[in-house]
């Protein structure tokens, strides 16, 4: 998606099938207010962006309302009347689901079921990562619905958990983004804890799968 034209790099993120963010990095035009023009239908006239993102006082992106649109975004980034980047992109290929909400934990002996609110669209994976201070890496389990049971836990150990949502690659393609992680929650003997002793700070989530 970041193909360059006249030195312009673009990034598209479709937040939760609600808002499309298109940002650009144009070293040649770093002190210029480039304008963003778009349409959702190949036959319509272009509209100009009304919600620009600014960086160091200059336009660097545009936010568009695009609630659950199964559309191609046609857009043109211009310097005055001169187009410096023109493209069309199928928006859903750059989907970033929202972070899981209402995450709950239900313990039964050596197993925990993690649930959260399913998003309003499908073909997603809900991933739970967990670790104890004795684990060198995060363990992971994922399901198509936000109802993930992890078995074989040690009731005496403290475990840290966090959850995220990913778009299925076979359905949405390879260019989507995972959601941000939910907050880390720590549990021991079926009870919530402030922290798990000796647990290293969780790594920042990567934007790759």
């Amino acid at each position: 998606q970041g193909g360059a034209a006249e030195g312009v790099q673009i990034q598209i993120i479709y937040f939760n099938l609600e808002t499309v963010q298109v940002t650009w990095n144009a070293s040649k035009y770093s002190r210029t207010n480039l304008t963003f023009h778009y349409r959702f239908n190949g036959d319509e006239a272009y509209d100009q962006c009304t919600n620009y993102l600014l960086q160091e006082g200059h336009t660097s992106g545009c936010l568009l309302d695009a609630e659950q649109r199964d559309d191609i975004l046609y857009f043109s980034i211009r310097n005055g009347t001169h187009p410096v980047f023109t493209a069309s992109r199928w928006m859903v290929y750059y989907l970033k689901p929202s972070s899981p909400k209402h995450v709950r934990f239900s313990w039964h002996q050596d197993a925990v079921t993690v649930t959260c609110s399913d998003l309003s669209y499908g073909d997603l994976l809900y991933e739970v990562q967990y670790r104890s201070p004795f684990d060198t890496e995060w363990q992971s389990k994922q399901e198509n619905t936000c109802n993930v049971t992890i078995e074989g836990l040690d009731a005496e150990k403290c475990y840290s958990f966090w959850v995220r949502v990913k778009a299925m690659e076979d359905v949405y393609g390879p260019d989507t983004y995972p959601s941000d992680w939910s907050e880390v929650t720590c549990w021991q003997r079926g009870e919530i804890r402030d922290a798990c002793a000796e647990t290293p700070t969780p790594p920042k989530p990567k934007l790759s799968k």
């Epitope: 199928w90 859903v92 499908g122 073909d123 198509n144 299925m168 949405y172």
Partner: antibody
Amino acid sequence: QVQLVESGGGVVQPGRSLRLSCAASGFTFTDYAIHWVRQAPGKGLEWVAIIRPSNGNTNCDQKFKDRFTISRDNSKNTLYLQMNSLRAEDTAVYYCARSRVWGGSLAYWGQGTLVTVSS
Amino acid sequence: DIQMTQSPSSLSASVGDRVTITCKASQNVGTNIAWYQQKPGKAPKLLIYSASYRYSGVPSRFSGSGSGTDFTLTISSLQPEDFATYYCQQYKSYPWTFGQGTKVEIK
């Protein structure tokens, strides 16, 4: 609007070959997975193969792998199904279908082309 | 291969009836299930994807549910145009497989 038009069907003798075509229009051909699905007369649907036109990756049901080959020509926005060593049980309507988004469920279907294998 | 078993294979119903069709997968397919409607001589039409999400333009009387191995397509109030054959299909793993179909006929 999205359109898929199959062609190339007809009557063919057992053991012979046939190449089906699926001409796509109304969308960016290289953005989607496209499939062949067949349906024998009075029977149910049977998935045959998939191709991702962007990279040419294919997957074919094992039972057709030795005889059927799925391919595409991006410059012509056309998908093909090469069928060799045809048998009477290959008699069916052959549909090409496009996924809803990049992959997944099949949202757009052609009208189908009938292949009859008979001596 | 994952087997998809639909039941019943056919049913008779009247306009206004609530109709339920079930589909059972031979192994866990998560929610990677689609439902299609097909009328004689026509290509199938997508109704439901990801087990429970209605495809755009599909009337709200059609709904899907289930995950794992057991799935249901429900038509809440059968309309004259709903008499057709319905297929479930899994897209969890290749080869993709369809159920054998359920024919909904007029009583």
